[in-house]
């Protein structure tokens, strides 16, 4: 069908509550494009009827709510005047219960579930709520160890819990809860956050922390397009360089002639105490020679790698 396949990393989410994923892939989605969502290579698009539990809302896919059987690979097809890209998103649903905020044992958890407060400082936790404009979110309530948080040191400000003069006792399991309203119906969103305390100034001193990747392998089909983000947290005043290397050479230099594998433009999000940097690596077309090679993300003295591997053969096809 002429569409380029792009594989995104897994999303791990909670059953029985709303979830939304936005199909954005700059610079493709910045122009005049159409976006269509599909599930598990189905030819039938996800419904656009807002009464449907799972439906497409502009560029988003929206689950109201997410259920056990919703795990799987979803594709959004972005069609432009001269291009077509198919983005694959692997959604894994796990059973999540009220007050079950200790989810650190799960693989590939995003940094949204693990946050850090800095001892003796005024700091904040963020409740990550990503939904389309059609969803109205009510005020957020915060809990620690299943009890609502209160006290003069805690202030709720939009999606953040401000904690003044952080103490060692502020570590532990938190949850933020909001009521989401969509088409007159109300749903509860509850996110668990494991909070640790650091004594170091800034965000982890001068050593940057690579959140993703985590020295792991990624299954990818031969010939496909793959984009992998390197997410790094570092102090606001850091002078560290962030880059992708292979065989101890910058990827842009290593693939200078073919330009088949390129490093993306670095972006960052600024938080009060630290910055979150993202720099991706794009494999325009995965070749046999790419398998088994460690592609290293460097951030100052910190490193983490990914290794591409061929998916195990699916013998059911024979």
């Amino acid at each position: 069908d002429g569409c380029k396949d792009i594989f995104m990393k897994n999303e791990i989410l909670s059953a029985s509550q709303p979830f939304a994923f936005n199909c954005t892939f700059p610079p493709i989605t910045s122009g005049e494009v159409s976006v269509t969502w599909y599930k598990n290579s189905s030819k039938i698009p996800v419904s656009k009827i807002i009464q449907s539990r799972i439906h497409q809302d502009e560029t988003w896919i929206l689950f109201l709510p997410m259920e056990w059987g919703d795990s799987g690979v979803y594709q959004c097809v972005i069609k432009g005047r001269d291009s077509c890209h198919r983005i694959h998103v692997n959604l894994t649903v796990f059973e999540k219960h009220w007050c079950d905020t200790s989810i650190g044992g799960l693989p590939n958890l995003s940094d949204e579930y693990k946050q850090i407060l800095h001892l003796g400082k005024d700091d904040s936790l963020t409740c990550h709520l990503h939904f389309p404009k059609s969803c109205v979110l009510g005020p957020i309530k915060w809990y620690k160890d299943c009890n609502e948080i209160k006290g003069e040191r805690f202030t709720v400000l939009e999606t953040r819990l401000l904690v003044s003069n952080v103490s060692a006792e502020d570590r532990g399991n938190y949850a933020c809860q909001a009521i989401l309203t969509h088409s007159g119906k109300q749903y509860e969103v509850l996110n668990g956050i494991t909070v640790s305390i650091t004594e170091r100034a800034g965000y982890g001193g001068s050593v940057p922390k690579i959140i993703y990747p985590k020295n792991h392998s990624i299954e990818v089909q031969l010939g496909t397009t793959l984009i992998v983000d390197c997410n790094v947290t570092d102090t606001k005043d850091n002078t560290n360089l962030r880059c992708w290397r292979v065989n101890n050479t910058l990827v842009d230099d290593y693939y200078d002639e073919s330009k088949r594998i390129r490093e993306g433009v670095e972006t960052h999000v600024s938080f009060r105490e630290h910055n979150l940097y993202t720099v991706n690596i794009t494999f325009l077309e995965v070749k046999m020679e790419d398998y088994g090679l460690p592609f290293m993300c460097h951030a100052g003295v910190s490193t983490a790698y990914i290794i591409l591997q061929l998916p195990a053969p699916d013998f059911r096809a024979y």
Epitope: H97, D100, D145, C146, R153, E169, R171, G172
Partner: antibody
Framework: QVQLVQSGAEVKKPGASVKVSCKAS????????MNWVRQAPGQGLEWMGM????????RLAQKFKGRVTMTVDKSTSTVYMELSSLRSEDTAVYYC?????????WGQGTLVTVSS | DIQMTQSPSSLSASVGDRVTITCRAS??????LNWYQQKPGKAPKRLIY???SLDPGVPSRFSGSRSGTDFTLTISSLQPEDFATYYC?????????FGQGTKVEIK
Amino acid sequence: QVQLVQSGAEVKKPGASVKVSCKASGYYFTSYWMNWVRQAPGQGLEWMGMIHPYDSETRLAQKFKGRVTMTVDKSTSTVYMELSSLRSEDTAVYYCASSTTAFAYWGQGTLVTVSS
Amino acid sequence: DIQMTQSPSSLSASVGDRVTITCRASQDIGNALNWYQQKPGKAPKRLIYATSSLDPGVPSRFSGSRSGTDFTLTISSLQPEDFATYYCLQYASSPYTFGQGTKVEIK
């Protein structure tokens, strides 16, 4: 360092009341719930209830409603638990336990003996 | 109210033995469960927070795990100082409830 220091042992007659204190130090007193747990001789642990020093919100186990009063003195970072209409089966060690992180720290315990 | 059923109520073991104690919750409590050790005349001491997080200073021979509503405290190699009574506590919803306790005695 977090410390919870409780008042000394008490001997009371049936029908009387007892007030046990728990003085907290080493953490932000008004930020976390304080629990009360009791343990009868040779028996297990029993949760009685909890109070939040910030606004004195109290939650009690059903069996203690009407007999237990929990109060706070923010100026001295002290929580009090008063148990009225004492009976012999109330003879127990009474503990306060802070919920800085779910029942992390415990007082040393206060033995209350109810005897005629 | 959530009931916590702890087993066994007592066990005899030797130094070096692997010991497991189980608590079963009558309904889902997520990971909101602690384990405590209590010695005679002393206040309970928390060993494990939120099912599996070891408290600072607690030896690594202690570990906690969960399967559904079944929770396990494991002592990988029993030491002389481990002979005590152990309790689980659920704090998912009030009224909070403890298991009945397990007394670990010397064989």
